[in-house]
């Protein structure tokens, strides 16, 4: 669809005559008829297949025609067509004399023709005007013409329909060839696809308008390139959504079980060396002069009974001093001036001469030690109990009192996390490398299946030993506030009593 535009510029009829040569009276009141049609090798009148248009009387005899387009007038003349412009045409321009105001053909004189011109040729669609001048023996007509596309039509032959829009169906303007040119921020064949915020992750982000970055489920961050870890993940990260990959030193489904108690809590005091020995368990190796589970107790240097052969120990600022009994000498009273003849072995020890009687050695009965069998054996000295267990002397033997979660003679064995049936309401317990996991029956949730869905989490009285239960409304779980002497998430473990020694 387009328009053939014809701009009449000047008509010269100096003698004021008709085509027949007859003079007009009083002058040739001139109007024009234009016929646009398909290309003909020899242009002849006939159906104006592309359109026809007439002007009013524009002047008498010779006159210039002013451009009326700005005022809504009829110059240039418009010959609209609603088909593909073929690129060729024929044009007939007739100048007629109208003695009166009625311009209908039947109202004109029978010889009213002043002049007729016929041209044909090729004409491409474009903004540029083609100037032409046609001269006959009596008249001259100067004019220009062009073909332009109608609004919303584009291309070499005005056949491409393109209507700019900025709505749900597209956001574009039209290029001269009719192709779409997307508005800033839009892309796609019909410019319906917004261009998201620069850097917005292709898979994990999307947008409904330009420069936006909305995250798909499981992703977060300005560019939707950060995964969201599992709900409740404490000390872990993710590489895909809902993962909980534990940080160094943490374990369990939610990475909330401390496997590196030493680093996270530094429990060992006074420069002791800390060794992790399992979930939330550790062993402190004390420096000389300290004792206690956390090496928190300062030892007197005499506490290690350094003086032998019954020597008495005296603390001094820079150490200690042994006062030796008669017959003994040396830093620790380790040298004897006695022999077996002096019966130096106590508690039934047997004396054996050494170095031709210059020295002796006592062979001690069980439960006694020392160079003179003067010391009762303390079987806890070597700290045989692992995982923070307390060593207790029991007559001729010893025993280890283990911390919760450990068992065995030396507390060397982890108790299975599932052994104490931690999953409530018939939940199934699964031992994991770093803890346990409960699979809950229908109607229950929580880490230990302790939460009745949509019911007060404390309704099942999960806390032991008369602990107070609080419901955490944000997570539908409970918290037990333990009375003195009990620990654990349900206050189920008694606190170990301080060790008592028989001497």
């Amino acid at each position: 669809s387009g328009v053939f535009q014809l701009q009449l510029q000047e008509f010269i009829n100096e003698r004021g005559v008709l085509a027949s040569g007859r003079p007009c009276e009083p002058g040739c009141r001139t109007f024009f008829r234009v016929c646009l049609k398909h290309f003909q090798a020899v242009v002849s009148p006939g159906p104006c297949t592309f359109g026809t248009v007439s002007t009013p009387v524009l002047g008498t005899n010779s006159f210039a025609v002013r451009d009326d387009s700005s005022g809504g007038g009829r110059n240039p003349l418009q010959l609209p067509f609603n088909f593909t412009w073929p690129g060729t045409f024929s044009l007939i321009i007739e100048a007629w004399h109208a003695p009166g105001d009625d311009l209908r053909p039947e109202a004109l004189p029978p010889d009213a023709l002043i002049s007729k011109i016929a041209i044909q040729g090729s004409l491409a669609v474009g903004q540029n005007w083609l100037l032409d001048e046609q001269t006959s023996t009596l008249t001259r007509l100067r004019y220009s013409y062009r073909v332009i596309c109608s609004d919303n039509y584009y291309g070499d032959n005005c056949s491409r329909l393109c209507k700019k829009r900025n709505d749900h169906f597209g956001h574009y303007v039209c290029q001269p060839d009719g192709n779409l040119s997307c508005l800033p921020g839009w892309t796609g064949e019909y410019c319906q696809q917004p261009i998201c915020l620069s850097g917005c992750h292709e898979q994990n982000g999307y947008c409904s308008k330009p420069a936006e970055c909305l995250c798909r489920p499981g992703w977060q961050g300005r560019l939707c390139n950060e995964c969201i870890p599992h709900n409740g993940c404490r000390h872990g990260t993710c590489s895909t959504p809902w993962q909980c990959t534990c940080d160094e030193g943490w374990g369990g489904l939610f990475c909330d079980q401390d496997l590196n108690y030493c680093t996270h809590h530094s429990p060992c005091k006074n420069g002791a060396t800390c060794s992790n020995s399992g979930q939330r368990s550790y062993t402190c190796t004390c420096r000389p002069g300290y004792t206690g589970v956390d090496c928190e107790l300062e030892l007197s240097e005499c506490d290690s009974n350094p003086c032998r052969n019954g020597g008495s120990c005296k603390d001094q600022e820079d150490g200690y001093h042994c006062l030796c009994p008669p017959g003994y000498y040396g830093l620790h009273c380790e040298h004897s001036t006695l022999s077996c003849a002096d019966s130096p072995c106590f508690n039934g020890g047997s004396c054996r001469e050494r170095n031709q009687g210059a020295n002796y050695a006592c062979e001690c009965p069980p439960n006694f030690t020392g160079s003179n069998c003067e010391k009762k054996v303390d079987r806890c000295t070597s700290n045989p109990c692992a995982n923070g267990g307390q060593c207790l002397n029991r007559g001729p033997s010893r025993m280890c009192r283990c911390r919760p979660g450990f068992t065995g003679t030396y507390c060397e064995l982890h108790v299975s996390d599932c052994a104490r049936n931690p999953c409530a309401h018939g939940g199934t317990c699964h031992d994991l490398e770093n803890g346990l996991m409960c699979t809950c029956p229908a109607g229950f949730s929580g880490r230990r299946c302790e939460v009745r869905t949509s019911i007060d989490a404390c309704a099942s009285s999960p806390c032991f030993n008369r602990a107070t239960c609080y419901t955490d409304l944000s997570t539908d779980t409970f918290v037990c506030n333990c009375p003195y002497g009990f620990v654990g998430s349900r206050c189920e473990f008694p606190v170990g009593l301080p060790p008592s020694f028989p001497w």
Epitope: V17, L18, A19, S20, G21, R22, P23, E25, S44, P45, G46, W96, R104, P105, E106, A107, L108, P109, P110, D111, A112, L113, S115, K116, S136, T137, L138
Partner: antibody, heavy 119, light 106 residues
């Protein structure tokens, strides 16, 4: 039906006069130019005279100038041709014709009336 | 005065194309009309404004006009087309007819 009917022809002596009439019907007579065309026996068509729709403009061939007069009465839808000073060479069939506006030519013709001039 | 010249006669076989010419000085600048006249009948307008056909005139009649010559063309000529044909234009004095051409269909 659009129709033109001529009358008034006949035999007349040289130097004599005749008045031809053309009665129009079936179209708006007062809106159209009208003309007379003659055809001598065995010859071609020859234009005689033409008159504008209101009678204000009249043109005639050089061969009849000063002798023949064209006129019209729009109230009677009638065209006239007054023939004076007739000559032998004026012997012909005289046709009344309606002239189409804007170089259309003569689109309606009467059946003709014969004028014979004897010497 | 202005003159239009036609050939006195043209012959054509039935079904063939007949062309009748009309010559005049710068005739292409004017509109030409053509008339058909059969013996004993009034003339009938068959072409006006060079190439236009009045209603009722068969499509086999066509016309053209350029330069100094106008042409009436009858394609697929029939016996009923046998007649005298006249061209007509205008000069400063009034109407001008050509001398006429007798078309014979053999």
């Amino acid at each position: 039906e659009v129709q033109l009917v001529e009358s008034g022809g006949g035999l007349v002596k040289s130097g004599g006069s005749l008045r031809l009439s053309c009665a129009a019907s079936g179209f708006t007579f007062r809106s159209h130019w009208m003309s007379w065309v003659r055809q001598a026996p065995g010859k071609g068509l020859e234009w005689v005279a033409i008159i504008s729709y209101d009678g204000s403009n009249k043109y005639s061939a050089d061969s009849v100038k000063g002798r023949f007069t064209i006129s019209r009465d729009n109230s009677k839808n009638t065209l006239y041709l007054q023939l004076n000073s007739l000559r032998a060479e004026d012997t012909a069939v005289y046709y009344c014709a309606k002239a189409g506006g804007g170089n259309v030519g003569f689109d309606i013709w009467g059946q003709g009336t014969m004028v014979t001039v004897s010497s | 005065s202005y003159e239009l010249t036609q050939p006195p006669s043209v012959s054509v076989s039935p079904g063939q194309t007949a062309s009748i010419t009309c010559s005049g000085d710068n005739l292409g600048s004017q509109y030409v009309s053509w008339y058909q006249q059969k013996p004993g009948q009034s003339p009938v307008l068959v072409i006006y404004q060079d190439a236009q056909r009045p209603s009722g005139i068969p499509e086999r009649f066509s016309g053209s006009n350029s330069g100094n010559t106008a042409t009436l063309t009858i394609s697929g000529t029939q016996a009923m087309d046998e007649a005298d044909y006249y061209c007509q234009a205008w000069d400063r004095s009034g109407v001008v007819f050509g001398g006429g051409t007798k078309l014979t269909v053999l």
